[in-house]
């Protein structure tokens, strides 16, 4: 249940458009887990690329790029009757407002590729 | 290049811990694309579960849960020599500060499952 049942939801139209945000992250170390090697062991493996932007918070985001057009079979060969596709997620980041140097930001949506999965084409069409 | 080259990076230790954030999202409709059906067509299919929390912004986040332990083969059977695993990503959300109803939040890290991928087990051991 909400801690403040009388508070308007932050997505309501009547909610203040500018809010104060504390950058001391909660759960900083919660959920920390050893780096997964799924990107190598997947049938739709991917590479991870560093996307850096000093005007953004967080300034570094890692993006996945599928290695193959098809998927890797049990023998290590690429099967082009299947597709390696990026799994994408919309995330929120903070973008520094250009006119206010130190402490003014704006929420921004980013579409990031988190990893890849192997899917069956709807239309099987190979030249 | 940074819009404000003299500005400290928001991740620097000397950066103000409390900042102003405009909730009018930039890129609200950017990258909007037709809803993907990969969750059904994947060899490691998943279901999407709604995670709702009125004290969080965004209040609704969709979480993926892999349907199978193994992966679906070309004939539609589950192959238990492979594993369906969740692809997870750490995201930032805004958590309402309990003592300040209207416009005070704190950044919080969340680990969310975005989708599933099919991986080769490290140890092939089936009872």
């Amino acid at each position: 249940s909400p801690q403040n049942p009388g508070c308007p939801n932050a997505e309501d139209k009547n909610f203040p458009r500018t809010v104060m945000v504390n950058l001391n992250i909660r759960n900083r170390n919660t959920n920390s887990k050893r780096a997964s090697d799924y990107y190598n062991r997947s049938s739709s493996p991917w590479n991870l690329h560093r996307n850096e932007d000093p005007e953004r918070y967080p300034s570094v985001i890692w993006e996945a790029k599928c290695r193959h057009l098809g998927c890797v079979d049990a023998d290590g060969n690429v099967d082009y009757h299947m597709n390696s596709v990026p799994i994408q997620q919309e995330i929120l980041v903070l973008r520094r407002e250009p006119r206010h140097c130190t402490n003014s930001f704006r929420l921004e949506k980013m579409l990031v590729s988190v990893g890849c999965t192997c899917v069956t084409p709807i239309v099987r069409h190979v030249a | 290049s940074p819009q404000n080259p003299g500005c400290p990076n928001a991740e620097d230790k000397n950066f103000p811990r409390t900042v102003m954030v405009n909730l009018n999202i930039r890129n609200r409709n950017t990258n909007s694309k037709r809803a993907s059906d990969y969750y059904n067509r994947s060899s490691s299919p998943w279901n999407l579960h709604r995670n709702e929390d009125p004290e969080r912004y965004p209040s609704v986040i969709w979480e993926a849960k892999c349907r199978h332990l193994g992966c679906v083969d070309a004939d539609g059977n589950v192959d238990y020599h492979m594993n369906s695993v969740p692809i997870q990503q750490e995201i930032l959300v805004l958590r309402r500060e309990p003592r300040h109803c209207t416009n005070s939040f704190r950044l919080e890290k969340m680990l969310v499952s975005v989708g599933c991928t099919c991986v080769t087990p490290i140890v092939r051991h089936v009872a």
């Epitope: 082009y80 579409l111 239309v123 099987r124 069409h125 030249a127 | -």
Partner: nanobody, 125 residues
Framework: EVQLVESGGRLVQAGGSLRLSCAAS????????MGWFRQAPGKEREFVAA????????AYTDFVRGRFTISRDDARNTVYLHMTSLKPEDTAVYYC??????????????????WGQGTQVTVSS
């Protein structure tokens, strides 16, 4: 949104070589697998080659395999098609395209949403 502009097409003798370039504008260029297609006069547009998002994997149609090479340089936002041992039947307008959907396999033309205006390649005998 991605805009694609091809260049490098010209008249060349049979047996010669060409390198086509496809320059992309738009920050999301690196998010897409890319492909080259071609259309000869009076014929349908057909698949030539494709390259994965990371550039690690490529695929070709049978009639160019071993003669053409597709590559990408994400730092320059450019995709290339290096064509060797050209034949008169390679004469066509060559189009670069970005694959944004995965309803079919890599050569399925409807999966490519963004297209350039094309560059003319003419191979004389």
């Amino acid at each position: 949104e991605v805009q694609l502009v091809e260049s490098g097409g010209r008249l060349v003798q049979a047996g010669g070589s060409l390198r086509l370039s496809c320059a992309a504008s738009g920050r999301t260029f690196t998010s897409y697998p890319m492909g080259w297609f071609r259309q000869a006069p009076g014929k349908e547009r057909e698949f030539v080659a494709a390259i994965s998002m990371s550039g690690d994997d490529t695929a070709y149609t049978d009639f160019v395999r071993g003669r053409f090479t597709i590559s990408r340089d994400d730092a320059r936002n450019t995709v290339y098609l290096h064509m060797t041992s050209l034949k008169p039947e390679d004469t066509a307008v060559y189009y670069c395209a970005a694959r944004t959907s995965y309803d079919g396999t890599y050569d399925y033309i409807d999966d490519y949403s963004y297209w350039g205006q094309g560059t003319q390649v003419t191979v004389s005998s």
